[in-house]
């Protein structure tokens, strides 16, 4: 019999009392079969860490900070129920901190140094950890102590909490650095009245102080929020233009046989009977004897963590890098304007050869990280542990909602002005072999199915887009009789045609050989009754182009398109006969990389781009015959975006809107975490 | 298509030093970009050190400073000399072209290098 139990770590007499107080009520409601709590008491939260890590507890609530501190080895938990504040139909699980300023004080982010600053208290997340943290690197040296490198930075603040004598700079604009609301600029509403009266140029609080303390927009338009790309944005767009976005309160549990399912189960269970104004003998989120005692007071109940999110992506890059550099206390050698090498994420093995042959060429301008999947690949550009990659459409989609942006855009067409011009896109298609003559759009039912990747723009969003409005569901494995959609669960239908050997059957990289444009197209010449790619794709897989022994002796007049009329018509008809019409591949970055992906990318391109003539003796940074490593094939150069710099304008409405009716049958686990993290 | 076997490998002290030798069975002038990796036991095949026709190098963090590569076309051989070796440098080393068959996975036999007092 499975143990059902949780046990839950308090940290004083108080917590413990109430955790017994827990324990008993759930009895009383939850069958015996169901989860059950048991109580550990330790003396601090870091004990709590330990216990729950060395498997001797379950699970604690942690704020922000600690959750950092869980997730670091050895102790490697990992969040995975979110406290939520607000109402259930707009719950708030995070705040943004953010750096407020005057409307017509004209300083950006990078230009703080010698301005005045107004916290809300030393130590404190949003008035102090986050904001020193970020400018760490930009303090003057010594850094320690910090309070030093703080003042001598600023020509003068209020940071409550610190100690006046040492620091005098520090208290300079509230005499005396009082710890408390005696001080009149101590807290969120503390530092907002301290910028608000002059004595600051910048008050570092949370996104809602400034609508807590201005009740009216005409007010509140005196104001705006410095953002880290060295812009400012209204007070209101603080989820574009923030320091850092926080969870509140967080329950962990180990990343490895954490229960977190059973976790859950009982939260989930324990805020139905004992959640906000459920019941009057026990609640969950009230203290009599005490503050904040297991639970937040103010919580008003619990969301389920997506199981793709673990500590790293779930405090975002921003908040871990402030932490990290306040705790490690390490910079680079010597701040210099001269950009990092790019961190260039690989897919497997075949990528990653590409990509090291790649950093050689470039002298260290290029480095390789590699990673199984696209999901994974984005999730390290995320996290910082890589920069940039090229993605489909698709993907491009799933990146911006994690916060990535596109960079620069593929071009696939050969024009004077390559760089300059992004083009308007590339068509999505459905090719069939003309000796099956009479299938149709209209009778795709029971027909063997291949595809680039699920996820993927021609081979899955924009087929399967058009599939879900027709048939309103999202069992495509039940419409097609097989097929080979890499990415599918393995046990699914989608992946019965796939031609990988062992683990890496039906995988969305090159070890499955029916991956891609080229493998949806082979799986079609193999295997299958239709094949969702993109428009150039036959041609360059016919009439010799493509040498391997599958694709040698094609010929393009074998094989014609389906049209969404229920025709179909030769290949290079595909400007009349086209599923839609899907966005290029682009380069994807973190904002903070943008103009250094950018800068680098476009001298490489120059180096090894498609003037490269002789590709047998030189790299080639856009070849890797009819693969597609790192970039398409046919990609002339990387093109600039122009105002076209977020996801949304990248992809155009159309087609964001199109991924969006199709979320509903998205299997992305990373689309499911980023999306808990901004709705 | 050119064949390379990979010797120069041994049992070496800390400190110590090494240097490996890749003989190619035709011509590498034409060669653009050759390089040196390496995968210890249970660890994924990682890049060493590369260099190009033109005499370009790149060389992993881990190894900056202590490794040196070069090529000699006439000989037609890349080279890695291993200076102040550690007990983390102990692996299987390869080289390799990138010419062959577009990112496809040919090794030869390597030669292996084992740091140890």
């Known amino acids: 019999v499975p143990d059902k139990t949780v046990r839950w770590c308090a940290v004083s007499e108080h917590e413990a009392t109430k955790c017994q107080s827990f324990r008993d009520h759930m009895k009383s409601v939850i069958p015996s079969d169901g989860p059950s709590v048991a109580c550990v008491k330790k003396a601090s939260y870091l004990d709590c860490i330990r216990a729950i890590a060395a498997n001797e507890a379950d699970a604690v609530t942690l704020d922000a900070g600690l959750v950092y501190d869980a997730y670091l080895a050895p102790n490697n938990l990992k969040p995975v129920v979110a406290e939520f504040y607000g109402s259930k139909e707009d719950p708030q699980t995070f705040y943004y901190a953010v750096a407020v300023v005057k409307k017509d004080s004209g300083f950006q982010m990078n230009q703080l140094r010698g301005k005045k600053s107004c916290h809300t208290g030393l130590g404190r997340s949003a008035g102090w950890n986050i904001p020193i943290g970020l400018l760490y690197c930009d303090l003057p040296e010594p850094r320690k102590p910090l309070e030093k490198a703080v003042a001598n930075f600023f020509s003068g603040s209020c940071a409550p909490c610190a100690d006046g004598t040492d620091f005098p700079q520090l208290c300079q604009l509230c005499p005396g650095c009082g710890c408390s609301t005696l001080n009149q600029y101590f807290g969120y509403s503390g530092a907002f009245k301290c910028l608000k009266d002059g004595a600051g140029d910048v008050a570092f609080v949370k996104h809602s102080t400034i609508f807590e303390n201005l009740a009216n927009k005409a007010d509140r338009d005196q104001y705006e929020l410095l953002c880290l790309d060295n812009t400012r944005k209204p007070v209101d767009e603080y989820k574009d233009c923030h320091l850092a976005q926080v969870p509140s309160h967080t329950v962990v549990a180990r990343s490895m046989g954490g229960k977190e399912d059973l976790i859950w189960e009982l939260l989930n269970q324990a805020q139905e009977h004992f959640g906000k104004d459920k019941s009057k003998e026990f609640q969950l989120f009230s203290s009599p004897h005490g503050k904040d005692l297991l639970f937040k007071d103010s919580a008003h109940g619990f969301l389920k963590v997506p199981p793709r999110m673990d500590a790293k992506m779930y405090l975002g890059y921003e908040y871990v890098t402030a932490i990290r550099n306040l705790r490690e206390g390490t910079c680079p050698e010597a701040p210099t304007d001269e950009c990092k090498p790019v961190k260039w994420c690989a897919l497997s093995h075949h990528e990653r050869l590409k990509c090291d042959e790649w950093s050689v060429n470039s002298v260290g301008k290029i480095e390789c990280v590699s990673a199984e999947t696209t999901e994974d690949c984005i999730a390290k550009i995320m996290n910082g542990e890589a920069d940039a990659m090229s993605l489909d459409g698709g993907f491009v989609y799933i990146a911006g909602k994690c916060g990535l942006v596109p960079v620069l855009a593929e071009n696939y067409n050969k024009s004077d002005n390559c760089e300059d011009t992004p083009e308007a896109g590339y068509f999505a298609i459905a090719v069939v072999k003309k000796s099956a003559s009479d299938l149709t759009w209209d009778n795709l039912k029971g027909k063997k199915s291949c595809h680039t990747a699920v996820g993927r723009t021609a081979g899955w969003n924009i087929p399967m887009g058009l599939l879900y409005n027709k048939i309103n569901h999202c069992r495509f494995d039940e419409f097609f009789s097989e097929g080979c959609a890499p990415g599918s669960k393995k046990d699914s239908s989608l992946c019965k045609l796939c031609m990988g050997s062992g683990l890496n059957l039906c995988e969305p990289n090159n070890k499955e050989g029916y991956y891609g444009y080229t493998g949806a197209f082979r799986c079609l010449v193999e295997k299958g009754d239709v094949a969702f790619v993109k428009h150039q794709t036959v041609p360059q897989n016919t009439g010799g182009k493509n040498p391997d022994p599958w694709a040698k002796n094609l010929n393009e007049k074998d094989y014609e398109l389906l049209c969404l009329d229920g025709t179909r018509k030769p290949v290079e008809e595909y400007a009349n006969c086209h599923l839609a019409r899907a966005p290029n591949h682009a380069v994807v970055t973190r904002k903070d990389k943008e103009a250094c992906v950018h800068k680098i990318l476009r001298q490489q391109q120059h180096l090894f781009g498609s003037n490269v003539t002789d590709c047998s003796g030189n790299f080639c940074l856009f070849r890797s015959e009819t693969k597609d490593l790192l970039f398409r094939d046919d990609t002339v150069c990387l093109a600039k975006l122009h105002d076209r710099n977020t996801y949304e304008k990248y992809l155009g409405e159309e087609y964001v809107k199109a991924v969006g009716n199709l979320r509903k049958c998205s299997t992305s686990s990373l689309l499911e975490a980023c999306t808990f993290r901004r709705p | 298509e050119v064949q390379l076997v990979e010797c120069g490998g041994g049992l070496v002290q800390p400190g110590g030093s090494l240097r490996l030798s890749c003989a190619a069975s035709g011509s590498i002038a034409s060669i653009n970009t050759m390089a040196w990796y390496r995968q210890a036991p249970g660890q994924q095949r990682e890049l060493v050190a590369g260099i190009t026709r033109g005499g370009s190098t790149n060389y992993a963090d881990s190894v900056k400073g202590r490794f040196t590569i070069s090529r000699d076309n006439a000989k037609n051989t890349l080279y890695l000399q291993m200076n102040s070796l550690k007990p983390e440098d102990t692996a299987v080393y390869y080289c390799?072209?990138?010419?062959?068959?577009?990112?496809?996975?040919?090794w030869g036999q390597g030669t292996q290098v084992t740091v140890s007092s």
């Open positions: 390799t072209d990138y010419s062959r068959g577009y990112y496809q996975d040919y």
